[in-house]
Each structure stands twice: as C-alpha cells, then as structure tokens.
C-alpha cells in the first residue's frame, strides 16, 4: 500500500477547521475490516485518531478530530481537525496498514491575522518641529509573531530607535507593540506595517503630524 499526503504545509486559521489530507489506493475487493489507520503526532508519537478492527476508534486528541467514514473505503484517510489552536501546529503522520503498511507525514501551520494597528502619540499636543515624540503601533491577537516595519511619508524605512515587544495570551495569540522615537520635521507621516509571515498579511496604521490637529 502506498500512502500519499500533500507536500506543502496545510495552513489553518485559529478557531477554524483543517483537513490533513492522506490517501491510499485500495486493491479490488478491499474492505474496511482489513484497514488499520493511525494518525499520530510525528515527533512525540502521541496517538491522535485511529481506525482499527473495522471501526472508528475515535479521537485520542482533545475530542476535536474526525475521519471521513464514508470515504475510507475509497482510500481517503484524511483527518479533520476542528477548532484549530496554536498548540496543534506541527507534523502529523498518517499510517495505513492493510497487508503491508506505509506512512507519510503532513505539516500543519497555524495562523491568526493581526488586527488593524492602533497608533498613539506621546506627547499628543503642543507639538513643534524638532520635538522628540514617541509613536506606538499596537496590533492584537495574531499568530505567529509579527514582523513590524516603519516607514516615513516617502516610503523610506525607519529603522533607528524602534523597540518592538510581543506578549501572548493563554491561547498563544500575540499582541505586538512597536515604539518609534523620532524627531519631528515640519510635517510628517509615519506608517507602521504589521506583517503576519505565514499569511503574508499586512496590517497598516499611520499617523500624520502637521501644524493642524493630528490625523490617524
């Protein structure tokens, strides 16, 4: 028996369902009584889900996994993982045994989009050219850790005096705070771009400082 999985990682958003595809080619006359199917975590060998002795043995993994029972006889051994979370990320191995056996591993990459950044300014009034200001760009509840880029109004990267920190909640979703310290020119736009490296999703925030009231 030959087992086939997708070579590219499966990317799943937090709190959505993901399908880890695995298939085999059943011989003519194949019946489910002959099938032993085991899904396990590749690294730790922890059992995730199994089908043996002609029946679905159920989820051994937080009760969030399921097979496609009607499709098993056609050689579809895919695993459905419900309500994906950060800790599900990793490699899963699909073992199929009929008379001989084969296995293959599929990688699950978890992601969550970052919110539109909010911008704050300190001090936020009586600003004059030549003043040093602190601009903070905050974006919330993303995964994995973000990449943060600052640019001026002409699109020139601002790299000096930037401090970025990230902290996560109990689910592993990150909040990112990036602080730019800059000396004000006569007019200026400062843009912050928060990038999710897995989703290639960019969230933008900007602040424009003029002699007039601030624009966010």
């Amino acid at each position: 028996v030959e087992v086939q999985v997708s070579e590219d990682p499966v990317v799943a958003l937090v709190d959505t369902d993901a399908t880890l595809r695995c298939s085999f080619s059943p011989e003519p006359g194949f019946s489910l009584a002959q099938l032993n199917l085991i899904w396990q975590l590749t690294d730790t060998k922890q059992l995730v889900h199994s089908f043996t002795e002609g029946r679905d043995q159920g989820s051994a993994y937080s009760n969030r996994t399921a097979l496609f029972p009607d499709l098993l006889v056609q050689g579809n051994a895919s695993l459905r993982l419900q309500r994906v979370r950060v800790t599900d990320e990793g490699s899963y191995t699909c073992f199929v045994s009929i008379q001989d056996f084969d296995s293959a591993a599929v990688s699950l990459q978890v992601a969550a989009p970052y919110s539109k950044p909010s911008m704050t300014l300190e001090p936020n009034k009586d600003l004059r050219p030549g003043n040093m200001v602190t601009i903070t760009c905050s974006s919330y509840q993303g995964y994995p850790e973000a990449e943060v880029f600052w640019k001026d109004g002409q699109g020139v990267p601002l790299t000096g005096n930037v401090t970025t920190s990230q902290m996560a909640n109990e689910r592993g979703l990150f909040d990112v705070h990036s602080v730019l310290r800059v000396v004000l020119g006569a007019n200026g736009t400062y843009s912050c771009l928060v990038r999710n490296p897995v989703l290639q999703q960019d969230a933008h925030g900007s602040v424009t400082i003029t002699g007039q009231p601030l624009t966010f």
Epitope: V86, T87, S118, N169, E170, R171
Partner: antibody, heavy 114, light 110 residues
C-alpha cells in the same frame, strides 16, 4: 507603566454581596482579556473568572452562578460582582491582564464571616 | 484537590539545578500551553514562564520551561537563595472550559 489597582474588598457576612473593581492604566485596556484570581490565607492560587476583549466570560466551577465578571472599557475598569458569599470565598483577590496574568495587581482582601 | 498536580515541596542547595513537575491530562497540559508563576513570600505572584517555554523580559535564563505529553516541568539552574518561593503551573482545561492553577510547590534553598 502598566498598572492594575484593585479595590472594594472588606468584611461581609455569609450570604452577602460585594463588588470588586480593578482600575487599569498604562495599556489599551479594551484590547485585552482580563481575569480574577484569588488566594485563600495560606493556600494556593485559584483562577476565578475571565473576560475576553470581546466580553465573552468564563468562570471556575466553584463560583459559577454566584459571581459575575464584567468590564467598562470607557472607564478602563474590570469588575467582579460577588453574590451569595460563603466562608470559603475568604481570600485575597487579584486582577490580572490576560487569563495567564502577565501583570498582577497588588490584591484586595475579602473576608466572609459572621 | 487540583486537576494539575505539583509536588508540595522541593529543595536544593545554592548552585544546584532543581526541577518542579506539573502533571495533568490530555484535556489541559496535553493540548494547551503551560505557564509558570513565582510567588515570593508576602508578595503578589509574577509570571515566570509563558507559552510553555518562553521567559518574559527580566526573568533570568536560569529559569526554563518544557512539556512532554501531559506533564510540564520548570527547571531552575544555578539555584540562588532569592529563588526560595512558591511556584505554580497553570494552563487552560478544555473539559472545564476554564483556566487552572496547580496546587503549588514550595521551594526551599538549603
């Protein structure tokens, strides 16, 4: 500087009520999950309740139906309404940022006794 | 009785390496992230390790966290007298739908 300041603790009789407040400063309160944890005298930590930034709430089994966690984002304040208090609710109550409490307040003491 | 089981006490001499365990189930440690807290005598607790193995800024790299299956561990190397404190593990529990603390471990530096 990120700060959390609890208030509202005190002495109350069994069956009575109390409302604890937690004033937050130094961070964008509305964007954060918040929670309450308590510690009975000489005992360990017990997570009491949590509220997501979107206001979904969670409770420990020991306080379900008696305690209510809420938030007022306009006031940067977290609350814990405690009803039907029992002697075993006597503890120091801490509020914290996130459910996993990366920042803690200094605590406020609740004593339930007749 | 806590769902997360920690030894009530642990001890070590200065310079030693000490490990504190936290045992749970597939519903909590098995499929969720683990966090560790230090509570010095008479003070509020402080986050020591989050996301199983990360240190917040300001926490010395003598402290490290790990997880295997349904158990987690906190290791303290180069033990110092100021490490004498209570240590708590915590994680989310899927069956209870709430956050949980372990019973705590009192660490004594001999």
């Amino acid at each position: 500087e990120v700060q959390l300041l609890e208030s509202g603790g005190g002495l109350v009789q069994p069956g009575g009520s109390l409302r604890l407040s937690c004033a937050a400063s130094g961070f964008s309160f509305s964007n954060y999950d918040m929670s309450w944890v308590r510690q009975a005298p000489g005992k360990g930590l017990e997570w009491v309740a949590g509220i997501r930034s979107g206001s979904r709430t969670y409770y420990a089994d020991s306080v379900k139906g008696r305690f209510t966690i809420s938030r007022d984002n306009s006031k940067n304040t977290l609350y814990l309404q405690m009803n039907s208090l029992r002697a075993e609710d006597t503890a120091t109550y801490y509020c914290g940022r996130y459910f996993n409490m990366d920042v803690w307040g200094q605590g406020t003491t609740v004593t339930v006794s007749s | 009785q806590s769902v997360l089981t920690q030894p009530p006490s642990a001890s070590g001499t200065p310079g030693q390496r000490v490990t504190i365990s936290c045992s749970g189930s597939t519903f909590n440690i098995g499929t969720n992230l683990v966090h560790w807290y230090q509570q010095l005598p008479g003070t509020a607790p402080k986050l020591l390790i989050y996301l199983t193995d990360r240190r917040p800024s300001g926490v010395p790299d003598r402290f490290s966290g790990s997880k295997s299956g349904t158990s987690a561990s906190l290791a303290i190397s180069g033990l110092q007298s100021e490490d004498e404190a209570n240590y708590y593990c915590a994680t989310w529990d899927d069956s209870l739908n709430s956050f949980l603390f372990g019973g705590g471990t009192k660490l004594t530096v001999l």
